[in-house]
């Protein structure tokens, strides 16, 4: 419906001139929700194009989007979050293309933050923790997180771990000794609400200890 893939990843859309994608973020600023749309064709001339949403709104029939560089944006408390809204691309009063979208099915969570990794010498493991603003939210509380890590020298060899909590333990023996690792995390709605992966958190970098030859164990840094 939105030009995104079912698995939460973006897909190459079959592009017509005005095909577009949108995502919602609920309670993104206190009790305010946001809706962000953009064209799928990077070459489309957006000069006179506007977006409008109608239906499934509280107290009003329609709302106009604000244009912010090349995205179209609404921040409001007026989303009903029940039923489908009609989102249209317009030039003047003329609608060029429209899509009916349930805003609860295009939710993009906020990116996780405060990612850190602590080495536990006695346990020979690494405890990965991160935070998410969604723990405090009323609506989108339940998320699936995707923790991805790689040895820094391995450009595209990411290992992914899915989890519902904000804490993960990585066993030292599963990692290379004396190596620099990059780790990052993203989130996707996992209960009632549907949608897309958040942006990745900022990456965190950590080094694994050397192997201690006498014991065969790694030395902490």
């Amino acid at each position: 419906e939105s030009g995104y893939a079912q698995n939460g990843d973006l897909e190459d859309a079959e592009l017509d001139d005005y095909s577009f994608s949108c995502y919602s973020q609920l309670e993104v600023n206190g009790s305010q929700h946001s809706l962000t749309c953009a064209f799928e064709d990077p070459d489309v001339n957006i000069t006179n194009l506007e977006f409008e949403i109608c239906g499934a709104l509280v107290e009003v029939k329609c709302l106009n989007f604000r244009k912010l560089q090349e995205i179209y944006f609404i921040e409001t408390k007026k989303f009903l979050l029940i039923g489908k809204s009609n989102i249209c691309v317009k030039v003047g009063e003329k609608s060029l293309t429209c899509k009916k979208i349930d805003l609860t099915t295009i939710v993009k969570p906020e990116a996780p933050f405060d990612l850190s990794v602590v080495y536990r010498e006695g346990a020979n493991d690494f405890v990965v923790t991160f935070n998410t603003s969604h723990l405090q939210k009323k609506y989108v509380k339940v998320l699936m997180h995707d923790v991805a890590y790689r040895q820094e020298k391995d450009e595209n060899k990411w290992t992914h771990v899915n989890l519902s909590s904000t804490k993960l333990t990585l066993l030292q023996r599963k990692l290379q000794p004396a190596a620099m690792y990059e780790i990052k995390v993203r989130s996707i709605p996992d209960h009632y609400f549907k949608g897309f992966w958040s942006e990745w958190s900022p990456s965190y970098y950590f080094r694994t200890p050397e192997i201690n030859n006498s014991s065969g164990e790694m030395d902490p840094i």
Epitope: G3, L10, D12, A38, F39, E40, P42, I71
Partner: nanobody, 115 residues
């Protein structure tokens, strides 16, 4: 102010691969469609590939279709160009910029395809 820093170019044999990176700063990267351009000596700068704001839409010049792939990482404010099956005619200085660019350009990165 806007800064665009391209990297990843080099000398490669025909049929080889390179991955170009462009680190952007000084503007809200995630609000713009981005593109790669190239300029060979004595020629006009040409559009190679473009990617939409969310990354789901991509367009390519006919000469690179099926060989080049543009992608973006909004968390890192970076746009990439994976170039496979390189040909001598791909030799040029490669630049990234907004699809609807301002006057500012980075220094570019030189790609030379030669045996």
């Amino acid at each position: 102010q806007v800064q665009l820093v391209e990297s990843g170019g080099g000398l490669v044999q025909p049929g080889g691969s390179l991955r170009l990176s462009c680190a952007a700063s000084g503007f809200t990267f995630s609000n713009y469609a981005m593109s790669w351009y190239r300029q060979a000596p004595g020629k006009e700068r040409e559009l190679v590939a473009s990617i939409s704001v969310f990354g789901g839409g991509t367009n390519y010049a006919d000469s690179v279709k099926g060989r080049f792939t543009i992608s973006r990482d909004n968390a890192k404010n970076t746009v990439y160009l994976q170039m496979n099956s390189l040909k001598p005619e791909d030799s040029a200085v490669y630049y990234c910029n907004k699809r609807r660019y301002d006057d500012y350009w980075g220094q570019g990165t030189q790609v030379t395809v030669s045996s």
